[in-house]
């Protein structure tokens, strides 16, 4: 039994990494395999996560991590049984993967103005919470080419648009995602998307 | 919110026991290791002992070592210092330090008296 | 046992001052300090940890340098609520050893 594909983490930098690897054949990760983490750190003990079968050679394994600070490193170990398949390292604040915001909410009725709110996916204490920016994503149902991304680089978590800027009368989506610039994070997931009927007032024509 | 909360001070003879006790709350107690500091009235910061999240592995200073014993009850998200043979010199504010990793947490403390 | 010495043990200084503070360990420690506040008859507040990493919280003016066995906490510009009591930590190896603390007094 061997690696194939070493284990590449990331971390949500609140309470979770997520590692994932894959095996040169097909593998029973979850009776056949161990991952043992533990924070470089005086006193830290060592953690055992049991993987989950990703695709037939494939693990994935969540490592729960109380507290995050961006000094912190651990140590990994992969067995099976009593042999020692790969041993790494993992600091998590140079693989951050945020959470996906919750909540999205669209606003319709507020005089000819679409509002977006969603919800920061962070507690306060948490140093992300003060640090993401986001990108909203807007598509209609009935037309595929008609898709566009906002980028909300301030850290309020809403979005105005004039609803004219979209077509009326038609179904339209929205789904967010979220980064950090300051740990040069990837994108977060996407939101799940939530719809709505667009429709506004055309303005009178004067003649 | 984390939070300690140390009790368990007080006024006692040389030569003398107490037990100080320290409740944890706002987090998982059992992850992370716990830490005894004291401070004499007027003086520095002195480490006394730290303990891991288990209870597997404790260490001690040598001025309290054989003297001094921390345990936990993680059952009761509670941390304990049990002091005998106490002296003048132990005289100190003792507080309990969550010290799992860097993000320090630390009680307001209990004031210990050794006097005759 | 790993020795930290401070310096100075006081400093009289003045709200907008730059204000420096030395810590050197007995032997090498990589990053593994952390500085303290203490304010009369409270607990003592994390500042810096790994030598250089500011605390959630803490006001960018506290800065933190050095590696091995030189260290350095720097407070940019002075403000009334930074007249305190600041100490070094090392986290290498047990016993955890502290500084024997600097007193930042007003000038």
């Known amino acids: 039994m061997k690696v194939l594909q070493e284990p590449t983490c990331v971390s949500d930098y609140m309470s979770i990494s997520t590692c994932e690897w894959k095996m040169n054949g097909p593998t029973n990760c979850s009776t056949e395999l161990r991952l043992l983490y533990q924070l470089v750190f005086l006193l830290s003990e060592a953690h055992t996560c049991i993987p989950e079968n990703n695709g037939g050679a494939g693990c994935v394994c969540h490592l729960l991590m109380d507290d995050v600070v961006s000094a912190d490193n651990y140590t990994l170990d992969l067995w099976a049984g009593q042999q020692l398949l790969w041993k790494g390292s993992f600091k998590p604040s140079e693989h951050v993967k945020p959470r996906a915001p919750g909540n999205l909410t669209v606003h319709t009725n507020v005089s000819d103005t679409l509002l977006l709110t969603w919800s920061n996916p962070y507690p306060p204490d948490n140093y992300l919470y003060n640090h993401l920016t986001y990108a909203v994503n807007i598509w209609s149902e009935n037309d595929p080419a008609d898709f566009r991304i906002y980028n909300v680089t301030y850290l309020e978590p809403s979005l105005r648009i004039a609803a004219s800027t979209l077509k009326s009368g038609i179904s339209y989506r929205a789904r967010v995602r979220a980064w950090a610039q300051c740990y040069n994070t990837t994108w977060s997931e996407w939101s799940p998307s939530t719809k709505w009927h667009n429709s506004y007032r055309e303005p009178f024509e004067q003649h | 919110e984390v939070q300690l909360l140390e009790s368990g001070g007080g006024l006692v003879q040389p030569g003398g026991s107490l037990r100080l006790s320290c409740a944890a709350s706002g987090f998982t107690f059992s992850s992370y290791a716990m830490s005894w500091v004291r401070q004499a009235p007027g003086k520095g910061l002195e480490w006394v002992s730290a303990i891991s999240g288990s209870g597997g592995s404790t260490y001690y200073a040598d001025s309290v070592k054989g003297r001094f014993t921390i345990s936990r009850d993680n059952s009761k998200n509670t941390l304990y210092l049990q002091m005998n043979s106490l002296r003048a010199e132990d005289t100190a504010i003792y507080y309990c330090a969550r010290y799992g990793n860097w993000n320090y947490i630390w009680g307001q403390g209990t004031l210990v008296t050794v006097s005759s | 046992d790993i020795q930290m010495t401070q310096s100075p043990s006081s400093v009289s200084a003045s709200v907008g001052d730059r204000v420096t503070i030395t810590c050197r360990a007995s032997q090498g420690i990589s990053s593994w300090l952390a500085w303290y506040q203490q304010k009369p008859g409270k607990a003592p507040k994390l500042l810096i940890y790994?030598?250089?990493s500011l605390q959630s919280g803490v006001p960018s003016r506290f800065s933190g340098s050095g590696s091995g066995t030189d260290f350095t906490l720097t407070i940019s510009s002075l403000q009334p609520e930074d007249f305190a009591t600041y100490y070094c930590q090392q986290a290498n190896s047990f016993p955890l050893t502290f500084g024997g603390g600097t007193k930042v007094e007003i000038k």
């Open positions: 790994a030598a250089s």
